[in-house]
């Protein structure tokens, strides 16, 4: 098995100008020429044979070395015999020099000759005379030189002419690789040989199309410096949807699937599912049947449940209790839960809109495992429709019409809304005077207000209440120099409103008789 060459540069492959750097510009010259097969190519020639002490440099563009460490340079050139040129015997030469310079990036157009490392002096095995010009195949010389190991990202090649009449017909730069092969369902890619002639490069294989590595047994091989692969280790196995056939993984046939690479063979599709294409890792569900994301591929496809049965309700002012029985058909699943949709409906046209976020649900609105719910904080004397839907793991996948049980009700009188604008009017050592505003929605006649208060550091473990009919009150018998939390709620025949936000008030210290304003430390909504 031959080693493969990877080209980094092939001047013959370029039809447009090479535009290498020539220094001085009057030295090497780029011209269109013909190769030995009369194919048009770009060549560089120099023939500064009349003057002594020539120093004409030609530098390639920057060559990225890729992964290579050992680089080969193949030069094809023609060199004209000095004897074929009249009157130049003292100044004409028949060799040139090859150099390289390693660098991590393109350093621009200047050739800094002192940075270049000489590879070799190149002499022609055959030069040609005036008579040889008749043959277009002008005694083409081929020389190969090796450079490396290289440590930087790329390099330049340079050719120094010292007074020869020469044409560079072809410059080829390449490195060697091991050929790509397939072994144990793993592809071992073209791999660059090592930096030393004796080195082995360990290569991890890539599984063939539709295969994956066997757990903790990665496929590996070694590429020798000669470009040959040595003994394989580890292997790949066919992915889900595929089974092994020779060096490849073939897809499962129609009506079959394979869900895991650990399965050796493909299996027939489960109930209510099918595969009408090859290479299935799972079977598609029939119309109206679905598979939840968490369902393993080997289980049957299922469908959403039917509607809950026997929906009943109970109204208590602005609170409604709903109860129902499970659906007749759970869709073939045991993960049925319930969700409630609340709509408020107008008296006239019977148009309904979603209830909004200020409605409370106990224990919750969605994901109900039990078959009951209490809906709170509804508006008084309002029409509502409640839809109770049974849901399972595939309900959200279904595009068909929702199946639900519904009930329409009218609420009674509601409790008052929250007290607002609580103010501290006066703060003493043992008493605090507060005032507040009536709720925005009394929802009836307010019979009294209830003030709840407690020492802040007690955190509501023990609290006191005080009732009053007016919108102000004085709270006495407090401890001096103590922070108290106050909350107030309104009371009507329909019940209690929500407490006002917490108000923190610090009583005056005992030592001082001076009044001061207490600072509100925190304020938050506190439910009944």
């Amino acid at each position: 098995q031959a080693a493969k060459e990877v080209l980094l540069l092939d001047s013959k492959a370029q039809q447009t100008e090479l535009e290498w750097i020539s220094s001085p510009p009057s030295g090497w010259e780029e011209i269109s020429g013909l190769d030995e097969n009369y194919t048009p190519i770009r060549t560089y020639q120099v023939c500064q044979v009349m003057e002594p002490n020539q120093n004409n440099w030609l530098r390639t563009n920057w060559i990225s070395k890729g992964n290579a460490q050992r680089i080969f340079v193949e030069l094809k050139f023609t060199l004209r015999d000095c004897n074929s040129l009249p009157g130049v015997l003292g100044t004409c030469k028949e060799t040139f020099n090859l150099y390289y310079y390693e660098t991590d990036y393109d350093t621009g157009r200047n050739i800094r000759e002192n940075l270049y490392v000489k590879i070799d002096t190149i002499a022609a095995d055959e030069s040609f005379t005036q008579g040889d010009l008749g043959e277009r195949k002008m005694k083409l010389n081929t020389e190969v030189r090796e450079i490396g190991p290289l440590s930087k990202k790329g390099f330049y090649l340079a050719f120094q002419d010292v007074g020869a009449c020469i044409a560079l017909v072809s410059v080829k730069v390449y490195y060697k690789k091991c050929w790509s092969i397939v072994e144990n369902l793993a592809v071992f890619p073209d791999t660059v040989t090592g930096s030393e002639f004796s080195s082995l490069v360990e290569v991890r294989g890539t599984c063939v199309s539709s295969a994956e590595e066997e757990a903790e047994n990665s496929p590996r091989m070694h590429c020798s410096a000669e470009g040959e692969w040595l003994v394989p280790i580890g292997k790949c196995i066919c992915k889900a949807g595929y089974q092994q056939k020779g060096d490849t993984c073939e897809p499962c046939g129609r009506r079959f699937y394979k869900s895991s690479s650990q399965d050796l063979q493909c299996s027939r599709c489960p109930t209510h599912s099918f595969s009408d294409r090859e290479g299935s890792s799972r079977c598609e569900c029939e119309d109206g049947y679905y598979r939840a994301p968490s369902d393993p591929p080997y289980v049957a496809c299922t469908r959403p449940p039917s509607a809950p049965q026997n929906l009943i309700f109970n109204i208590n002012q602005t609170t409604v209790s709903l109860e129902w029985s499970p659906p007749a058909d759970n869709g073939g699943r045991n993960d049925v839960t319930y969700r409630i949709l609340c709509k408020r409906c107008s008296w006239e046209q019977g148009e309904c809109v979603p209830c909004g976020s200020n409605i409370g649900y106990m224990p919750q609105q969605t994901g109900l495992e039990d078959n009951y719910v209490t809906v709170m904080d509804l508006l008084a004397h309002a029409n509502y429709t409640f839809e109770v839907e049974a849901v399972n793991g595939v309900s959200d996948l279904s595009r068909s019409q929702r199946l639900f049980a519904a009930v329409s009700i009218t609420t009674g009188q509601a409790a008052p809304s929250q007290v607002s604008g609580v103010m501290k009017e006066r703060v003493l050592q043992r008493s605090v005077q507060l005032s507040w505003q009536e709720p925005e929605h009394p929802n009836g006649v307010i019979t009294e207000y209830e003030i709840k208060y407690y020492e802040k550091d007690q955190r509501e473990r023990t609290y006191s209440t005080l009732k009053t009919k007016s919108t102000s009150a004085s709270i006495n018998n407090l401890k001096p120099g103590t922070v108290y939390v106050f909350q107030i709620r309104a009371v009507t025949a329909a019940g209690y409103g929500n407490y006002s936000p917490r108000l923190d008030v610090a009583t005056l210290e005992e030592a001082s008789g001076k009044m001061f304003e207490a600072t509100a430390v925190s304020s938050e909504q506190n439910p009944v």
Epitope: L34, M50, T78, L85, G87, L133, R136, M138, A167
Partner: antibody
């Protein structure tokens, strides 16, 4: 750019001498040989010979020895053609042309505009 | 001395046509045979060297071939500016020109 500049027309009497200059610019004068070519009125081109601008060594074609001399002044990048003992048949346009040697072959790649030398009594 | 014979002496062509000029050497001159173009009142211009290589700036409608004793210059589609006299030249021990071929408008 590279160019060769020759002097204007000359009218000479038979037996006289003429020195035709060819001033080079735009390149290193000593790096290319210089050739001389004659073209008689209504006739073709006739190669007279060439001079190595580095060594000063001249080469003359058959029929252009003796009365014809190629010379150089490298300090002013100029080649000269001197013709002595002029004859009527020397009436022609004289061109200097830079010689280009290449791997693939040779040629005169840059030409002066020519100097007409008329020999008439 | 090597003698170069060009033919025809005059070639009449119309613009856009192909023109083929011949140059024959009395003995082999390898491929070291350039071609020149000369227009009236102007210096010659190098068209081809080494039998088939075009210098920079010469249009690719000019091509040449041949080796040994028989050489050809071809103008693939003659343009109005191509009407001129064409000379071949050899670089033997003594450099000689052919007598020229005049390409004129038909």
């Amino acid at each position: 750019q590279v160019q060769l500049l020759q002097s204007g027309a000359e009218v000479k009497k038979p037996g006289a001498s003429v020195k035709v200059p060819c001033k080079a610019s735009g390149y290193t004068f000593t790096s290319r040989a210089m050739s001389w070519v004659r073209q008689a009125p209504g006739q073709g081109l006739e190669w007279m010979g060439w001079i190595n601008t580095n060594t000063g060594n001249p080469t003359y074609a058959q029929g252009f020895t003796g009365r014809f001399v190629f010379s150089l002044d490298t300090s002013v990048s100029t080649a000269y053609l001197q013709i002595s003992s002029l004859k009527a048949e020397d009436t022609a346009v004289y061109y200097c042309a830079r010689v280009r040697f290449t791997v693939y072959g040779d040629g005169m790649d840059v030409w002066g505009q020519g100097t007409l030398v008329t020999v008439s009594s | 001395e090597i003698v170069l014979t060009q033919s025809p002496a005059t070639l009449s062509v119309s613009p856009g046509e192909r023109a083929t000029l011949s140059c024959r050497a009395s003995q082999s001159v390898s491929s070291n045979l350039p071609w020149y173009q000369q227009k009236p009142g102007q210096a010659p211009r190098l068209l081809i060297y080494g039998a088939s290589t075009r210098p920079t700036g010469i249009p690719d409608r000019f091509s040449a071939s041949g080796s040994g004793t028989d050489f050809t210059l071809t103008i693939s589609r003659v343009e109005p500016e191509d009407f001129a006299v064409y000379y071949c030249q050899q670089y033997g021990p003594s450099w000689t020109f052919g007598q020229g071929t005049k390409v004129e408008i038909k």
